[in-house]
């Protein structure tokens, strides 16, 4: 058993049938010796008394907030949680796998620069009783400070009958340096409670990896006189590095018919301008990517031929 | 990804096209020991990240961009020693740090290539043949070495008496390699800065 | 999901006894709670015992307090209800119900998963 925070406690199971569980002694946070009582989770019914309580910890149902009285005055509270372990894996019931880009993937995350501010987000099919809280750091053994906010619902979907929920939470590295080569990767750390349940999910990356520049703005097209062709421009995204002489980006640019199943031209180039071929109907998209390490590349920026 | 390669202009900053060709290289050779040692932790999630020239060469700092001079976070060792120039600096008037930059880059290169040929004659010993250094790779050090023109003493290379654990040896391999390319980024961040000042 | 199967009613003569037994299977690791729930002809559903967890707590209606015990056999995944001297008034359908919620584990309207009931006359 760890203390998660104040009151809260995290009784760890090793889940097979006949399982003996977990012994777990309460004791009421009073100087009081006697005449103290117990109950579990708003019943009003007396579970034993004492200044200590004993139970088994078998179980979800076992754990809840004992709450420790004494003359109809609330003394103490502990809330007990169930981290549950199954042949040897700690569960991971919470979060959905999203299988990207590997399996067991539950967090992803994303940087647009080189700042050492980061996106994580993750999926869940529950909707009611859940909380999450995220701790980050530069490293594990000699940690360096990562300050995260909270983590907010920031999308809904429905998928099939299912409703999915994605949360999101920003963090930013407390002295980041964007030119600094990293040997230590960051860590992301999610604690995730539904009801009585508790489960922990980890992730470790390095800024660099996790580079996704914002599209290109401001595409323009400027036709060329007597001629079917067009020059592209486009500027780098406002939250992309600076200066961007040192921070380079490449581009991709493709033109793209209304049918999928045309073929696309697709030319690369490290300038902000490219001169292509307008056909009919089709439209012209720019997508970026970090010229010197190539980690993702950012969405589309498109505007039609027309 | 294959891309265009732009050839320099006779009047560019002569030491870019080297560095773009050392990026170019070093991560074809990382992609091919990846692939050949792919039995072994040689990702960038498996290995541990070493620096071999940490303590020795202070390049990302005394390369930093003006612009990240205001940030606190990047002036954490600063050095501000004075080297003469070498010749990627042609007909520039650059101030002491710009040389001082390009010439722990140039000692960067020179830690490297001891490290990599010392590597490479272990390698060469390996009865299974499995792995050697490209000479692309070697020579393309080489070539921006000389770019760079640093007068600097020659270090000699390692020779060691012990029988080499091939093992161990290519699992060495697998950490310069993610090193080098990583300081390859950087030295190619900084020739693109030097050549658009 | 969680599955329930009730065993064990019948007709029995007041001042005896029965065993009802509740078998779960499914997901039983997610409930909070396992109760007994009874209802008797033209009258609505009725709380009358509930286990939590393991048996760390139980809870009974007044009605059956000293003459009914509920238990648990977590190995088998089985909940228990002793019912001792029996009334004519204890006649009902009684229902095993699951609750994956921590709290009002006396409130019906909080289970999520029930059993087909098995029948309980007490007569003479």
């Known amino acids: 058993i760890w203390e998660l925070k104040k009151d809260v406690y995290v009784v760890e199971l090793d889940w097979y049938p006949d399982a003996p569980g977990e012994m777990v002694v309460l004791t009421c946070d009073t100087p009081e010796e006697d005449g103290i009582t117990w109950t579990l989770d708003q019943s009003s019914e007396v579970l034993g008394s004492g200044k200590t309580l004993t139970i088994q910890v078998k179980e979800f149902g076992d754990a809840g907030q004992y709450t420790c009285h004494k003359g109809g005055e609330v003394l103490s509270h502990s809330l007990l949680l169930l981290h549950k372990k199954e042949d040897g894996i700690w569960s991971t019931d919470i979060l959905k796998d999203q299988k990207e880009p590997k399996n067991k993937t539950f967090l992803r995350c994303e940087a647009k620069n080189y700042s050492g501010r980061f996106t994580c987000w993750w999926l869940t099919t529950i909707s009611t009783d859940l909380t999450f809280s995220v701790k980050s750091s530069r490293g594990s053994s000699d940690p360096q400070g990562v300050t995260c906010g909270a983590a907010t619902l920031s999308a809904e979907r429905v998928r099939g009958d299912n409703k999915e929920y994605e949360y999101s939470v920003e963090c930013q590295e407390d002295s980041a340096c964007p030119a600094a080569e990293e040997s230590l990767p960051i860590e992301v750390m999610v604690d995730a409670v539904h009801k009585l349940k508790y489960e922990n999910y980890t992730s470790s990356f390095f800024i660099r990896d996790i580079i996704k520049p914002d599209p290109p703005k401001n595409l323009q097209l400027k036709p060329l006189k007597n001629s079917r062709q067009v020059e592209v421009s486009w500027e780098y995204p406002d939250t992309w590095s600076t200066p961007h002489s040192y921070f380079s980006l490449t581009f991709c640019v493709q033109v793209q018919g209304k049918s999928k199943r045309e073929k696309k031209d697709r030319v690369f180039t490290d300038k902000t301008s490219a001169t292509v071929i307008c056909r009919k109907n089709a439209s012209i998209s720019v997508r970026a990517q970090d010229r010197y390490y190539s980690s993702s590349w950012s969405e589309w920026a498109s505007v039609p031929c027309s | 990804r294959n891309l265009p390669v732009a050839t320099p202009d006779p009047g560019m900053f002569p030491c870019l096209h080297h560095s773009q060709n050392l990026l170019r290289a070093v991560s074809n050779m990382l992609q091919k020991a990846r692939q050949t040692l792919e039995f072994y932790p040689c990702t960038s999630e498996e290995i541990d990240h070493e620096d071999i020239t940490k303590d020795k060469t202070s390049t990302v700092e005394a390369c930093l961009p003006l612009e990240l001079t205001k940030n606190e976070s990047c002036l954490n060792s600063r050095e501000t020693s004075f080297i003469t120039n070498g010749s990627c600096l042609a007909s520039r008037k650059t101030s002491f740090m710009m040389a001082l930059c390009l010439s722990s880059i140039y000692e960067d290169l020179k830690m490297y290539q001891v490290e990599f040929k010392t590597m490479n004659a272990k390698l060469l010993m390996d009865p299974k043949r499995q792995i050697f250094l490209d000479q692309n790779m070697l020579a393309v050090i080489d070539e921006l070495m000389q770019a760079l023109n640093f007068n600097s003493e020659t270090v000699p290379q390692k020779s060691s008496l012990e029988e080499p654990d091939f093992y161990k040896t290519k699992i060495k391999l697998c950490i310069l390699l993610h090193a080098f390319r990583i300081r390859a980024v950087t030295i190619d961040r900084v020739m693109s800065y030097l050549n658009a000042s | 999901e969680v599955q329930l199967v009730e065993s064990g009613g019948g007709l029995v003569q007041p001042g005896g006894s029965l065993r009802l037994s509740c078998a779960a299977s499914g997901r039983t690791f997610e409930t909070i709670a396992m109760g007994w729930f009874r209802q008797a002809p033209g009258k609505g559903l009725e709380f009358v015992a509930v286990?939590?967890?393991?048996?760390?707590?139980?809870y009974y209606a007044e009605s059956v307090k000293g003459r009914f015990t509920i238990s648990k056999d977590s190995s088998k995944n089985t909940v228990y209800l002793q019912m001792n001297s029996l009334r004519a008034e204890d006649t009902a359908v009684y229902y095993c119900?699951?609750?994956?919620?921590?709290?009002?584990?006396?409130?019906?309207?909080?289970?999520?998963?029930w059993g087909q009931g098995t029948q309980v006359t007490v007569s003479s």
């Open positions: 286990i939590r967890g393991s048996g760390v707590a139980t």
């Open positions: 119900a699951a609750t994956t919620n921590r709290f009002k584990n006396t409130d019906y309207t909080t289970y999520d998963y």
